[in-house]
Amino acid sequence: MVPEEEPQDREKGLWWFQLKVWSMAVVSILLLSVCFTVSSVVPHNFMYSKTVKRLSKLREYQQYHPSLTCVMEGKDIEDWSCCPTPWTSFQSSCYFISTGMQSWTKSQKNCSVMGADLVVINTREEQDFIIQNLKRNSSYFLGLSDPGGRRHWQWVDQTPYNENVTFWHSGEPNNLDERCAIINFRSSEEWGWNDIHCHVPQKSICKMKKIYI
Amino acid sequence: LGEPQLCYILDAILFLYGIVLTLLYCRLKIQVRKAAITSYEKSDGVYTGLSTRNQETYETLKHEKPPQ
Amino acid sequence: LGEPQLCYILDAILFLYGIVLTLLYCRLKIQVRKAAITSYEKSDGVYTGLSTRNQETYETLKHEKPPQ
């Protein structure tokens, strides 16, 4: 038999035990609090840094696009797709009809200055969308050219030229010296493409990917 | 409600649940210990040495790494 | 780590903590019940065997991996 403990020793032992248990409780609660704080604050900081990133991204565009029009993509409030305010949006791209008249090279430069390219038309639906904003008595440069004059047409963004997805007016292209493509309206065939001399000033259409913030 | 918002609400619920349960567990533990001491006083010394046992157990817990 | 991923990880930690503590709490509660019944049946040895019981309980906690 072990000698009996004094009541005060037992009291002291109980006190120590209580202290240890409550210390554990405090430690556990502190750890929980850390977890919870991390869960609350870090996302807040994440949101903050995301906002900072967004702002810096917006600042990149600010020089030429002082204001953006954004729409929420899907259900997540995190994902916004934006187009510069005067531009129109269709699917994942933004479009701008430049009413200033310039040669093909200058038109492409003008688009690139705005973070875009002359328009590359990939589908009939895209062309149908674009023509809604065009004037029938004007011609507009496309991002399509034949630099060597050998009928090797190429898009400015290196998208492969697919003969099956082209909308040339009948009889076009018809001149090896006409190395740039425009879209224009002909009463007989409505809207279609035509080859013209690159240095003759025309209006143009710029296209850029939507800005995701 | 969006997915992230739900996650935070769940966080808050689990956090509160964790705190309440920690307190209840510690309270129960102390009650058990008090009961053991009371029982010791009433009986002929069943729990001589239990205190060291518990001591060891807490020794181990004490060194446990906190969650990263 | 992305914002939602972090939330889900912390959810998991809090969830595991809640489960472990719930199990421990229930186990302790059952022990107290059993001890009470034993004490009722055998009033001279209120908590016979409780010491090993507690040892096991803490054994469980002791081997638990710390949350990552």
Partner: antibody, heavy 120, light 107 residues
């Protein structure tokens, strides 16, 4: 070598129409480039008035839009300027010029110019 | 429209001197600038295009420089045939406007 030559009356009465012809030799106006009318006022200020492209499309300076018309006769390799409702402010030397040289970086070919005076 | 401001309006210099004429655009014209020389009673002659490229047959004493909105034409070692009027013209976007001109006279 490309050559441009302006012709037309040197004196026009106010409110009447001014008509000028530009005859081009050495290049077909329907083969390429765009063909401009530029005028120089007595104080030496130069103004682009408008053009007709090789494909027949036109551009007119907005300041003249309602009064100006540029047409062509491809069989004669000529293009024309018509300016309605003239005033004394339209007194100037009128040049016809080929546009689009150097990837549209400068006007290399000019006619020698014709002086038109608007006076009663 | 892009406005072109040319300076000075007139300039007197002696043969052998170096002169500089400047042209300021109201917007970025991306180096699409031409310089012309015009003698009394003649049509303008292209000297420089794309801000710095000399046109065919233009002497090397002429040089163009600049970017964005500020451009200049420099004539080294002035010759008697260099006297006359000089104009700048932008070619960025229609309408292509001219500067007011600089009259270069013999001192």
């Amino acid at each position: 070598d490309v050559q441009l030559q302006e012709s037309g009356p040197g004196l026009v009465k106010p409110s009447q129409s001014l008509s000028l012809t530009c005859s081009v030799t050495g290049y077909s106006i329907s083969s390429g480039y765009y063909w401009n009318w530029i005028r120089q006022f007595p104080g030496n200020k130069l103004e682009c008035m408008g053009y007709i492209s090789y494909d027949g499309s036109n551009y007119y300076n907005p300041s003249l839009k309602n009064r100006i018309s540029i047409t062509r006769d491809t069989s004669k390799n000529q293009f024309f300027l018509s300016l309605n409702s003239v005033t004394t402010e339209d007194t100037a030397t009128y040049f016809c010029v080929r546009g689009g040289d150097y990837d549209d970086g400068g006007f290399a070919y000019w006619g020698q110019g014709t002086l038109v005076t608007v006076s009663a | 429209d892009i406005q072109m401001t040319q300076s000075p309006a007139s300039l007197s210099a002696s043969v052998g001197e170096t002169v500089t004429i400047t042209c300021r655009a109201s917007g970025n014209i991306h180096n699409y600038l031409a310089w012309y020389q015009q003698k009394q009673g003649k049509s303008p002659q292209l000297l420089v295009y794309n801000a710095k490229t000399l046109a065919d047959g233009v002497p090397s004493r002429f040089s163009g420089s600049g970017s964005e909105t500020q451009y200049s034409l420099k004539i080294n070692s002035l010759q008697p045939e260099d006297f006359g009027n000089y104009f700048c013209q932008h070619f960025w976007i229609i309408p292509y406007t001219f500067g007011g001109g600089t009259k270069l006279e013999i001192k």
